[in-house]
Structure formats: structure tokens, C-alpha cells
Interface confidence: low
């Protein structure tokens, strides 16, 4: 139609100018479009330079929209992480503060002369929670061994107790149970509780990190072309106000975000595992009950030692022989009063319940984040036509969009009519993030069963599913050798990656 040749390019001028480009590039009226590389080659209001500028701009706009969506998710995960982390640290700090306030009065020198040992225990629990390479059972075993030596000496200042005698005491300890049931109970409960808490918080961190890294994955050149065609070619071809057909938009974005959609299965597995592990936050072995009550187990242990002192001493003498009397030493220490025990069950504050119910709801909301991205971006960012009618932009003209909508993920894009996707070349960054999701899910599943994946016994038969390379700490491949209870090293062992100062500090 000759009349269309002289059609004004006013609408394109407005859009192009609003994008910050120079209006001197825009033709006054339509020109022949043989020069176009992306848009259909009819009469057009776009020069080659305009087409290139708009292609770059549409690419940048999609990347920005993608980053915006990711940022919202990242912010949610980071907020969750901070809330849970604050709560768990608060529980442990509360327990330590209670201990520091009550133990001097309850146990006198039995506590004050060993305050450093207790402080170090809390430091190590804190470090373990934060992800440090230490074996919680080892840490607790060493703590009790050191404490027994020190308290036994204090309870018998009239005796000379050389190292070899203390070695013998240490060897007898397991059978004698000098601290009663408290060490065993604390070990069983603390291991489960700390493993659950730390793996849940790590899960939030890994999820957030995956989103951050995937948001940085650049969109390929084929995607650029397809998005240009989707968003701006209608303007170049003088089809004013034609909004993209919904299925057309979905196909473009499913092609552009094919690799991202491949995160879906492992992302769901991770979030499911995180929701599942919150079950371990309740009950007598639950996070709140145990982490906030460490001091009560410690009090119970010292009480048990005092109650059993005479029997214990007799059995130790029976097994290790009569120790020499210390001529300078005072008489045997008077039996102390029992330290009053706080109720072991912390009444739930309600804070954790609120945090967990919010987290569960939010994690469920974002389960289909990766596969719903094309739909989300199409509806929110593209101002789509409301119906698949004959009036929407289908990439060539106004009219119905006929091709079917592709499935999700890379493999399903083999016949995508809008974006040429090489399904044999998955994005390396995204593959790496899929592996990280697998590793973290593996940790959470182990944690659900009360195991720290970094310390699976060498005696395990190795059966069961797993991600192969699923270890994030160097201790995965190495079981720490149990220090014999006779080696009198300081309670703070050198923790890799932490200065001595940091290893000893308390909040």
C-alpha cells in the first residue's frame, strides 16, 4: 500500500527518544527495511543503528528485570538467614550468660577456677554452629575429660595427682560415669540440635548464594535477538500499541532462561529439605530446648560429680591405686551445696514458631521460582495482551500466535521457534550451582537423621544416595582422630582459619 510508505515515524521517535538515544537517527517517515538483521524486513522506522541500539537495550532491560526478581528472592532469603541466625546465637548467648551469672554462686571455685574451660566450650559451640571444621562429639568429649581432671584435683587438694594418675582416671571415666547421664544426654541432643540449626542456616545461605550467582549469568546473543523482536520490532514496523502475545513472550523467555529452569528440581529438593528439618526444632531434643539449655546440663553434671564423689574416689583408687598424699595440701574439700537447676525445658518463647511458620510459607512461595520466571517476567514486565487474540504482536505482525508453548528447561527447547538454543551446551555456572544445591540438600538430609555429613563414620557401608562430591568442609574426607583423654592440651584447640583470639572470645 503506497500510503504506508509515507507513514510518519512519530511513535518510534517518542520511544527511541525516551530511551535516551539521539533523535537524529530516526527517519522522518518509513524506509525500506532490507538492512534489518533482526526485525522482519518490511517498511520500517528503524535504521541498522537503531535496531542495534534497541537490541542492546532490550537485552539490558531483560537482564535488569531478571536481577530485580532475583534481588527480591535474595533479600527474602538473607532476611530469613539473619533472623534465624540471630535467634540461634541469642539462645546460646542467653545460656552462657545464665551460666556466668549463676554458677559462681552455685558452685564457687569449682566453677570460677574453670571458667575459662566453660567459656571455651561455648566458643567452640558457637564456632561449630558457624560452620567451623570441628567435630562436636570430639569437642564435648575433650571438654568432659579436661573438666574431670580439673574438678577431681580440686575435690582432692590433699592428694598428689601426677599426670600418669590422671591418665588412669581418664581411662576409668567412661565406665565410672562421673558426671552421671548429663554428658551422654548433652552429646545426643546437642549434636542433633546444632546440626539441624547450622544446616538450616547454611541452607538459606546456599540458596541465597545460588540466586546471586545465577542472576549474574549473561543472556546469550540469540536471546538478545529474540527479546529485541519481542519488545521493539513492533515499533520499528509501525504497529503502534501492539502488545506481545502471551504465548509468544513465554516461548522467548523459556528459551532465554532455559538453563535457569534446570535448577528447578534441585532447588525444590533443597527447599523441601529445609522445610523438613524445621521439624527438628521442637521437642526435648529440639534446637530451642537444647541450645538454650546447655548450662543446665553442665550444672547437672557438676552436681552428679559432687554427689558421686566418694563412690567415684573409691572406684578410682581401686582401679588406679592409692595416690600419694600432698603434705602441703589442705584437707579434703567440703562437699559443696548442690547448684540449683533451672528447669531444663525452656518454655518456648514463640519467636521460633513465628520464624518457622513465616519461613515455611515463604519457602513454599518461591519453590517454583525458576520455572515461573518466564511467566512472571512476561506478565509483570511486558504489558502483555490480555488474550491470545488476533490483535497481539506475534513477532511478524499483528495476529494470532500459533506455535505451542515449550516445556521448561534446556532439553525442552530443542524446537523453540523463537530462540535458537544449543541444548548440548549447558551453562557451566548454572551446572555448578545445581551441584551446590545437591551438596546442601545432602547435608540437610543427613542433618535430619541427626548426622553431620562432615563426620560420617568411616565404618559406614557407604550405601545410599548422594551427590558424589558433596562435601563443603575439608573434614569430609578425614575423621579427626580422637585425642586420648590423657593428653592435657588446653581446651581451645587451634581451629583452622580462626585466630587464637577469635577462638577464645565470647559474645
Amino acid at each position: 500500500d503506497p500510503a504506508s510508505k509515507s507513514r510518519s515515524c512519530g511513535e518510534v521517535r517518542q520511544i527511541y527518544g525516551a530511551k535516551g538515544f539521539s533523535l537524529s537517527d530516526v527517519p522522518q517517515a518509513e524506509i525500506s527495511g532490507e538492512h534489518l538483521r533482526i526485525c522482519p524486513q518490511g517498511y520500517t522506522c528503524c535504521t541498522s543503528e537503531m535496531e542495534e541500539n534497541l537490541a542492546n537495550r532490550s537485552h539490558a532491560e531483560l537482564e535488569t528485570a531478571l536481577r530485580d526478581s532475583s534481588r527480591v528472592l535474595q533479600a527474602m532469603l538473607a532476611t530469613q538467614l539473619r533472623s534465624f541466625d540471630d535467634h540461634f546465637q541469642h539462645l546460646l548467648n542467653d545460656s552462657e550468660r545464665t551460666l556466668q551469672a549463676t554458677f559462681p554462686g552455685a558452685f564457687g571455685e569449682l566453677y570460677t577456677q574453670n571458667a575459662r574451660a566453660f567459656r571455651d566450650l561455648y566458643s567452640e559451640l558457637r564456632l561449630y554452629y558457624r560452620g567451623a571444621n570441628l567435630h562436636l562429639e570430639e569437642t564435648l568429649a575433650e571438654f568432659w575429660a579436661r573438666l574431670l581432671e580439673r574438678l577431681f584435683k580440686q575435690l582432692h587438694p590433699q592428694l598428689l595427682l601426677p599426670d600418669d594418675y590422671l591418665d588412669c582416671l581418664g581411662k576409668q571415666a567412661e565406665a565410672l560415669r562421673p558426671f552421671g547421664e548429663a554428658p551422654r544426654e548433652l552429646r545426643l541432643r546437642a549434636t542433633r540440635a546444632f546440626v539441624a540449626a547450622r544446616s538450616f542456616v547454611q541452607g538459606l545461605g546456599v540458596a541465597s548464594d545460588v540466586v546471586r550467582k545465577v542472576a549474574q549469568v549473561p543472556l546469550g546473543p540469540e536471546c538478545s535477538r529474540a527479546v529485541m523482536k519481542l519488545v521493539y520490532c513492533a515499533h520499528c514496523l509501525g504497529v503502534p500499541g501492539a502488545r506481545p502475545c502471551p504465548d509468544y513472550c513465554r516461548n522467548v523467555l523459556k528459551g532465554c532462561l532455559a538453563n535457569q529452569a534446570d535448577l528447578d528440581a534441585e532447588w525444590r529438593n533443597l527447599l523441601d529439605s529445609m522445610v523438613l528439618i524445621t521439624d527438628k526444632f521442637w521437642g526435648t531434643s529440639g534446637v530451642e530446648s537444647v541450645i538454650g539449655s546447655v548450662h543446665t546440663w553442665l550444672a547437672e553434671a557438676i552436681n552428679a560429680l559432687q554427689d558421686n564423689r566418694d563412690t567415684l574416689t573409691a572406684k578410682v583408687i581401686q582401679g588406679c591405686g592409692n595416690p600419694k598424699v600432698n603434705p602441703q595440701g589442705p584437707g579434703p574439700e567440703e562437699k559443696r551445696r548442690r547448684g540449683k537447676l533451672a528447669p531444663r525445658e525452656r518454655p518456648p518463647s514463640g519467636t521460633l514458631e513465628k520464624l518457622v511458620s513465616e519461613a515455611k510459607a515463604q519457602l513454599r512461595d518461591v519453590q517454583d521460582f525458576w520455572i515461573s520466571l518466564p511467566g512472571t517476567l512476561c506478565s509483570e514486565k511486558m504489558a502483555l495482551s490480555t488474550a491470545s487474540d488476533d490483535r497481539c504482536w506475534n513477532g511478524m505482525a499483528r495476529g494470532r500466535y500459533l506455535p505451542e508453548v515449550m516445556g521448561d528447561g534446556l532439553a525442552n527447547q530443542i524446537n523453540n521457534p523463537e530462540v535458537e538454543v544449543d541444548i548440548t551446551k549447558p551453562d557451566m555456572t548454572i551446572r555448578q550451582q545445581i551441584m551446590q544445591l545437591k551438596i546442601m540438600t545432602n547435608r540437610l538430609r543427613s542433618a535430619y537423621n541427626g548426622n553431620d555429613v562432615d563426620f560420617q563414620d568411616a565404618s559406614d557401608d557407604g550405601s545410599g544416595s548422594g551427590s558424589g562430591d558433596g562435601c563443603l568442609d575439608d573434614l569430609c574426607s578425614r575423621k579427626v582422630s580422637r585425642k586420648s583423654s590423657s593428653s592435657r592440651t588446653p581446651l581451645t584447640h587451634a581451629l583452622p582459619g580462626l585466630s587464637e583470639q577469635e577462638g577464645q572470645k565470647t559474645s
Epitope: 545461605g205 541465597s208 582459619g497
Partner: antibody, heavy 130, light 102 residues
Framework: AVTLDESGGGLQTPGRALSLVCKAS????????MFWVRQAPGKGLEFVAG????????PYGSAVKGRATISRDNGQSTVRLQLNNLRAEDTGTYYC????????????????????????WGHGTEVIVS | ALTQPASVSANLGGTVEITCSGG???YGWYQQKSPGSAPVTVI????NRPSNIPSRFSGSTSGSTATLTITGVQADDEAVYFC??????????FGAGTTLTV
């Protein structure tokens, strides 16, 4: 420009301890995982230790596991390697190296475990155990 | 350790490929001109090239094998090339090195 300067090498006595320091500049040190890699005379590269940006994740190569401690001071932009109970086979050039990508998330520990993503190396410091 | 050929040779201006296998998902390639001199990263994370490295160096992976390709080989490319990755216990490892003779 990124620079990594190692120091602390020289002639060492078997059975004693060694402390190497790497001073970094030209990048935001606290955002990057760091490594120590060594090379025995006439041999290939060997992973010694890695440390993530927070200092929590610290994997060690099998030859030094149990004898080495890697630590970092983000304020001073330094990473330190302490190697105890030195042996003749610890002789070689020790290089400080940097992970390619910054980590701003709270848990980037996995970066300390791979030798696939190093983008900068120091000139090395020579250690002779004799 | 990672498996890579002990040596490869190339003609000036030709193309050469060095392979590496036995590691995890990602590989790095490090060039060392002489023993004791600092390595230089030519490829990291399998495919990324630092900005100061010429475009004739490229990396790719297929399955569990990584390949360093140098197109238009120059005399200055003569060196030992080490690959790096991680092992099954997720700790860093390097290959024994491949000597490129031009």
C-alpha cells in the same frame, strides 16, 4: 593491579615450624578466597591449603593435613600458612594465589576447595628444609 | 591426580589441544614458563579467560574432560601447562603438567 607478595621462606630445619605470609593488594581482600600452592624442585604444582573469605572453611592437601594451619587477617590483607614438623619433602617454592570471583554472600565456603578458579599468583617464596 | 599428557608439540601458527580429566565440574589452566617462576592463569572455571590473556587461548569441557585450545600458536607459548580442579573428597588438585614444544 592485583599483587601478592610472599615472605618467610629460606633455609629451615627439619622438625621445626615454618610461617609464611602473603600480603595482598589491589583488590578487596575480605571478599576473596585465598590459597597456598607449592612446587617441589622439578615437580608439578600441589594444592597446600585454601581459606574462604570469612576464614571458616579451610581445606588442606593430603601431604600437609594435620601439620598445616592456614589463617587470614582481613584487616591487614594477609594470609598466613603455618607448617609444623617440617620434612625434606616440604622443600619447594610456595605460591600465594587468589580465587577469581568475589564472594559477598554469607556462605561461600565451597570456593576454598577447588583449584579451578585461580586468577592471580604471587612470585613465590623458596623454602629449603635441610 | 588429574590426567594430562606429558608433552605435546605444535607448529608455529598451528592449533594445539591439551586435555585434562579426572576432576570435578570445573577446571583451570595455568602456564609456567620455567620451573620456580610464577604460574600465569590462562583459563579459569573451564572457559573464562583473564583480561590480560590473548584470545588465542580458549577452554572447553566435554563430560569430565577439559580441553585447553591454543589457536595460532606462537613461540612465546612454549611452557608447561598445568590443569587444576578438585578431587572426589572435594579438595583442590593439579595435573602433573604438559610440556608444550613449539
Amino acid at each position: 593491579a592485583v599483587t601478592l607478595d610472599e615472605s618467610g621462606g629460606g633455609l629451615q630445619t627439619p622438625g621445626r615450624a615454618l610461617s609464611l605470609v602473603c600480603k595482598a593488594s589491589g583488590f578487596t581482600f575480605s571478599s576473596y578466597t585465598m590459597f597456598w600452592v607449592r612446587q617441589a624442585p622439578g615437580k608439578g604444582l600441589e594444592f597446600v591449603a585454601g581459606i574462604d573469605n570469612t576464614g571458616i572453611y579451610t581445606p588442606y592437601g593430603s601431604a600437609v593435613k594435620g601439620r598445616a594451619t592456614i589463617s587470614r587477617d582481613n584487616g591487614q590483607s594477609t594470609v598466613r600458612l603455618q607448617l609444623n614438623n617440617l620434612r625434606a619433602e616440604d622443600t619447594g617454592t610456595y605460591y600465594c594465589a587468589k580465587y577469581a570471583d568475589a564472594c559477598t554472600g554469607p556462605w561461600c565456603g565451597s570456593s576454598a576447595y577447588t583449584a579451578s578458579t585461580i586468577d592471580a599468583w604471587g612470585h613465590g617464596t623458596e623454602v629449603i628444609v635441610s | 591426580a588429574l590426567t594430562q599428557p606429558a608433552s605435546v608439540s605444535a607448529n608455529l601458527g598451528g592449533t594445539v589441544e591439551i586435555t585434562c580429566s579426572g576432576g570435578g565440574n570445573d577446571y583451570g589452566w595455568y602456564q609456567q614458563k620455567s620451573p620456580g617462576s610464577a604460574p600465569v592463569t590462562v583459563i579459569y572455571d573451564s572457559i573464562n579467560r583473564p583480561s590480560n590473556i590473548p584470545s588465542r587461548f580458549s577452554g572447553s569441557t566435554s563430560g569430565s574432560t577439559a580441553t585447553l585450545t591454543i589457536t595460532g600458536v606462537q613461540a612465546d607459548d612454549e611452557a608447561v601447562y598445568f590443569c587444576g580442579s578438585y578431587d572426589s573428597s572435594y579438595v583442590g588438585i593439579f595435573g602433573a603438567g604438559t610440556t608444550l614444544t613449539v
